[in-house]
């Protein structure tokens, strides 16, 4: 006579919210006679899931006909799965007892875990911009997934990054989980057009990972290089002062011309030229009439980029001795 075995073939069952879950249980022997009940959990606090005799279990149906005397299949189907249904389910054979039935043998259990997709990863950059050579942090967050196992990778322009730290919470059993990862990226001057990508792979995604991206343009500030040149004009005693502001990002730049310390013109960069790397160039010029100048003229160009401290570049226009007796005049 074969000894009764309770067979629960699946150790883990992944089910999405709203789906039905089939919990399989077969027995190897019809004997001894007695009912098979289903429980979630173990010990005195276990929850009765199905009992063919007692109780009302509207969401539970049996897979086979339990009224057939030769039935050896005690599998059940639970409909409309919710997160509250997660747990380990046991089919348990009882012998009739008085006043209570006596547990005879339990199956090994099937863990039902909620199969929930992770949310689309959201990548956020640093609160403030940083300049090239500095390191900035990007954070990737995704939540609501189950089971807990998940893979997260970082890429910069398609190249995998290695400097990142990832946490999945909570550490223990939960209905669903969240992931948070922080990657450290060293900025380069050409990173205006760069992109970081956070890629999340999970069993629910069938090999098609979710991605979230962030543009390094939101995190980088490339300070301008400044160059001042002067060119004498053929017509009369005029000098064209050209101020070139090169390779800066972002666009917001303000330029102020000062003549001997006095503001003579302020302008905001508007007609910019864009470089291949995404930085900008801008040229401003000032026409100075030197014929009427008595003293040397100190021309200062003050550049304020992206709210940073102003950078000054000065140029001295030397006036000839006989002109120093004349009154000065500048055309702007």
């Amino acid at each position: 006579e074969e000894e009764l075995q309770m067979i629960q073939p699946e150790k883990l069952l992944l089910v999405a919210v709203g789906e039905s879950a089939t919990l399989n249980c077969t027995v190897t022997s019809l004997l001894p006679v007695g009912p098979v009940l289903w429980f979630r959990g173990v010990g005195p606090g276990r929850e009765l899931i199905y009992n063919q005799k007692e109780g009302h279990f509207p969401r539970v149906t049996t897979v086979s006909d339990l009224t057939k005397r030769n039935n050896m299949d005690f599998s059940i189907r639970i409909s409309s799965i919710t997160p509250a249904d997660a747990g380990t389910y046991y089919c348990v054979k009882f012998r009739k007892g008085s006043p209570e039935n006596v547990e005879f043998k339990s199956g090994p259990g099937t863990e039902m875990a909620l199969r929930a997709k992770p949310s689309a990863p959201v990548v956020s950059g640093p609160a403030a911009r940083a300049t090239p050579e500095h390191t900035v942090s990007f954070t990737c967050k995704s939540h609501g997934f189950s089971p807990r196992d998940i893979t997260l990778k970082w890429f910069k322009n398609g190249n995998e990054l290695s400097d990142f730290q990832t946490n999945v919470d909570p550490a223990g059993q939960s209905v669903s989980y969240s992931i948070r990862s922080t990657a450290r990226v060293v900025l380069a001057p050409w990173d205006v057009r760069s992109q970081v990508t956070c890629e999340v792979a999970h069993v629910t995604l069938q090999g098609d990972p979710l991605r979230g991206t962030a543009n390094l343009s939101e995190a980088i500030r490339v300070p301008p290089t400044l160059e001042v040149t002067q060119q004498p004009m053929r017509a009369g005693n005029q000098v064209n002062i050209t101020y070139q502001v090169r390779n800066f990002y972002p666009q917001n730049l303000q330029l102020t011309w000062l003549e001997n310390g006095n503001v003579c013109r302020t302008e905001t960069a508007s007609t910019l030229t864009e470089n291949k790397d995404g930085t900008y160039n801008w040229t401003s010029w000032l026409l100075v009439n030197t014929s009427d100048q008595r003293d040397d003229v100190v021309l200062t160009c003050q550049v304020k980029h992206d709210g940073q401290l102003a950078v000054n570049k000065s140029l001295v226009l030397e006036v000839s001795a006989h002109q120093k007796d004349q009154s000065s005049d500048a055309t702007h």
Epitope: V33, R95, V102
Partner: antibody, heavy 119, light 107 residues
Framework: QVQLVQSGAEVKKPGASVKVSCKAS????????INWVRQAPGQGLEWMGW????????NYAQKLQGRVTMTRDTSTSTVYMELSSLRSEDTAVYYC????????????WGQGTLVTVSS | DIQMTQSPSSLSASVGDRVTITCRAS??????LAWYQQKPGKAPKLLIY???SLESGVPSRFSGSGSGTDFTLTISSLQPEDFATYYC?????????FGGGTKVEIK
């Protein structure tokens, strides 16, 4: 094949005890429970009690409590029902019946033992 | 205790007739009901268990139906060997109880 063979008819005096045996063959006693049912002459069926084939656990009808005892001997595959303090109204045919499945129906019955209580 | 009320207590029918016997439980017993046939001087014989499951070897003219409190045993075409007394029994909870029986006699 499965059989339940009961002991023979008994005639007892009021106040005496009777012990009816039910020998099981063709199956393992441990695997099935037994119900005892009686039937007075010309009357219907009356459930007397139940004994577990697994551990000898019992449950008796309230009206027989204190007078009935059900036991089992797994070594001989025999179940016993003893009724004490017999009265004339205990005159009946006594049946042992096997509990056939978890639906707890009686799928096999003994041939019955007539117990007559008469002074 | 769960009371089982069987009706009718007796009926007369002819061979080939369709016979219906009812059994009512005093409270819900789901499908925990068995039907037995007993002939004079013999032990009862199981016909139906779990309200509607036909016991192995029992002719298919016997059928059971019902759930909760109301149950029916039907003999679709009465045969000569079917003249007997029929009992329902609730197997839901102790104390197990039988209906009073229905005697099916030849008309």
């Amino acid at each position: 094949q499965v059989q339940l063979v009961q002991s023979g008819a008994e005639v007892k005096k009021p106040g005496a005890s009777v012990k009816v045996s039910c020998k099981a063959s063709g199956y393992t006693l441990n695997n099935y429970d037994i119900n005892w049912v009686r039937q007075a002459p010309g009357q219907g069926l009356e459930w007397m009690g139940w004994i577990s084939g697994y551990n000898g656990n019992t449950n008796y009808a309230q009206k027989l409590q204190g007078r009935v005892t059900m036991t089992r001997d797994t070594s001989t595959s025999t179940v016993y029902m003893e009724l004490s303090s017999l009265r004339s109204e205990d005159t009946a045919v006594y049946y042992c019946a096997r509990v056939g499945s978890s639906w707890e129906e009686n799928d096999q019955w003994g041939q019955g033992t007539l117990v007559t209580v008469s002074s | 205790d769960i009371q089982m009320t069987q009706s009718p207590s007796s009926l007369s029918a002819s061979v080939g007739d369709r016979v219906t016997i009812t059994c009512r439980a005093s409270q819900s017993i789901s499908r925990w009901l068995a039907w037995y046939q007993q002939k004079p001087g013999k032990a009862p014989k199981l016909l139906i268990y779990a309200a509607s499951s036909l016991e192995s070897g029992v002719p298919s003219r016997f059928s059971g139906s019902g759930s909760g409190t109301d149950f029916t045993l039907t003999i679709s075409s009465l045969q000569p060997e079917d003249f007997a007394t029929y009992y329902c029994q609730q197997t839901h909870s102790f104390p197990l109880t039988f209906g009073g029986g229905t005697k099916v006699e030849i008309k």
